[in-house]
């Protein structure tokens, strides 16, 4: 699927269901208790496919991964399968630097939430990354949305600079990640 970045535009362009960020330096100032606290500004490069690249065209490169911000609404499971079809997985956050990069990207879409690759079967079982690895709350806290009416939000999304649990069936955007070896 081709998504085109118009370099003469100061905003994010959405074509064919993908959001491409310029990683502008002026969006969303850090606020207290947000995930942006103490995060160094990061640089991301969008691939065009013209030069040799470890990422598919129009994915964003950051460190050793390629990222695609999908703007088609889907459940968590549907989003996971959408990423699989693109040879990737829902986002797994491995470091504070990566977290800062992701926050910077999604903060330019303050009205939208994005599924990441964290889920659990039910509240008594720990959160698990999509690849089966353990979740450590040292990296970030998951803010709960649980209520009496909605007692089991067992999937996770990021909204601006906060990570929340949410009902897995709620349609949302998503972030696909494809790791590569340097």
């Amino acid at each position: 699927t081709m998504a085109i970045w118009r370099s003469n535009s100061g905003s994010n362009t959405l074509e064919n269901g993908y959001f491409l960020s310029r990683n502008k330096e002026n969006h969303s100032q850090p606020t207290q208790s947000s995930l942006e606290d103490s995060v160094t500004p990061t640089k991301a490069v969008k691939t065009t496919g013209v030069l040799s690249s470890p990422c598919p065209p129009n994915w964003i490169i950051y460190e050793k991964s390629c990222y695609l911000f999908s703007m088609s609404l889907n459940s968590w499971d549907g989003s996971k399968r959408q990423c699989w079809q693109l040879g990737s997985n829902l986002l797994k956050i491995d470091s504070s630097n990566e977290l800062g990069f992701i926050v910077k990207q999604v903060s330019s879409q303050p009205d939208n939430s994005f599924w990441i690759g964290l889920s659990r079967p039910q509240t008594e079982v720990p959160w698990l990354w999509e690849d089966g690895s353990t979740f450590s709350s040292n990296l970030f806290q998951i803010r709960t949305t649980a209520t009496q009416e909605n007692p089991s939000p067992n999937c996770v999304w990021i909204h601006v600079s906060v990570i929340y649990d949410q009902l897995c069936s709620v349609p949302s955007y998503s972030i696909c990640e494809k790791k590569f070896s340097m």
């Epitope: 079967p121 698990l128 089966g132 353990t134 450590s136």
Partner: antibody
Framework: QVQLVQSGAEVKKPGASVKVSCKSS????????IHWVRQAPGQGLEWMGW????????NYAQKFQGRITMTRDTSISTAYLELSRLRSDDTAVFYC???????????WGQGTLVTVSS | DIQMTQSPSSVSASVGDRVTITCRAS??????LAWYQQKPGKAPKLLIF???SLQSGVPSRFSGSGSGTDFTLTVSSLQPEDFATYYC?????????FGPGTKVDIE
């Protein structure tokens, strides 16, 4: 490639304890739960519990509470299962397995036969 | 604890046959179910996770389906190396539990 290598077969007397080791390689040991599963001769599979190698947190099946201990040594990427107060019906092959997607067990050790006999 | 039952307990089949094994959970487990193959004297091998996702390296003749309480493992065209015992496993709640197994042997 991911590998889990277990310690050798053991013969124990009733009332004794046994400690089985499971050495991991080919991945970051602290990133994935290690499960222990046992299989009595000619029987099915039985989940005993898990350990989070990063934190050391454990979760044991109620059936084994009080006589099971799971530990790990991150410096040598090894998980351990200790079962005490052994009975003859504890005779089984004990497997370690690495957690994978959706809490499945994607990689298994070769198994350790523990025989409990007087 | 969630009880897992499998049927049939054993099945005789020939190479090329389509074989279907069912697994039922005593309560809903969404899609938190895995399937394993075990041969005598060997450790189990993961075939399917998340009820329907094929583990890397597993032949595409294996497929899984179902959600909630009823699940199916299908082998579309049985090969000589597929004669083994198959187990389902729920990962929805502690303790994780396995089905009793289905033995697939040569007719």
């Amino acid at each position: 490639q991911v590998q889990l290598v277990q310690s050798g077969a053991e013969v124990k007397k009733p009332g004794a304890s046994v400690k089985v080791s499971c050495k991991s390689s080919g991945y970051t040991f602290t990133d994935y739960y290690i499960h222990w599963v046992r299989q009595a001769p000619g029987q099915g599979l039985e989940w005993m519990g898990w350990i989070n190698p990063n934190s050391g947190d454990t979760n044991y099946a109620q059936k084994f509470q009080g006589r099971i201990t799971m530990t790990r040594d991150t410096s040598i990427s090894t998980a351990y299962l200790e079962l005490s107060r052994l009975r003859s019906d504890d005779t089984a092959v004990f497997y370690c397995a690495r957690n994978s997607a959706s809490y499945s067990f994607g990689y298994w050790g070769q198994g350790t036969l523990v025989t409990v006999s007087s | 604890d969630i009880q897992m039952t499998q049927s049939p307990s054993s099945v005789s089949a020939s190479v090329g046959d389509r074989v279907t094994i069912t697994c039922r959970a005593s309560q809903g487990i969404s899609s938190w179910l895995a399937w394993y193959q075990q041969k005598p004297g060997k450790a189990p091998k993961l075939l399917i996770f998340g009820a329907s996702s094929l583990q890397s390296g597993v032949p595409s003749r294996f497929s899984g389906s179902g959600s909630g309480t009823d699940f199916t493992l299908t082998v579309s065209s049985l090969q000589p190396e597929d004669f083994a015992t198959y187990y389902c496993q729920q990962a929805y709640s502690f303790p994780f539990t396995f089905g009793p197994g289905t033995k697939v042997d040569i007719e």
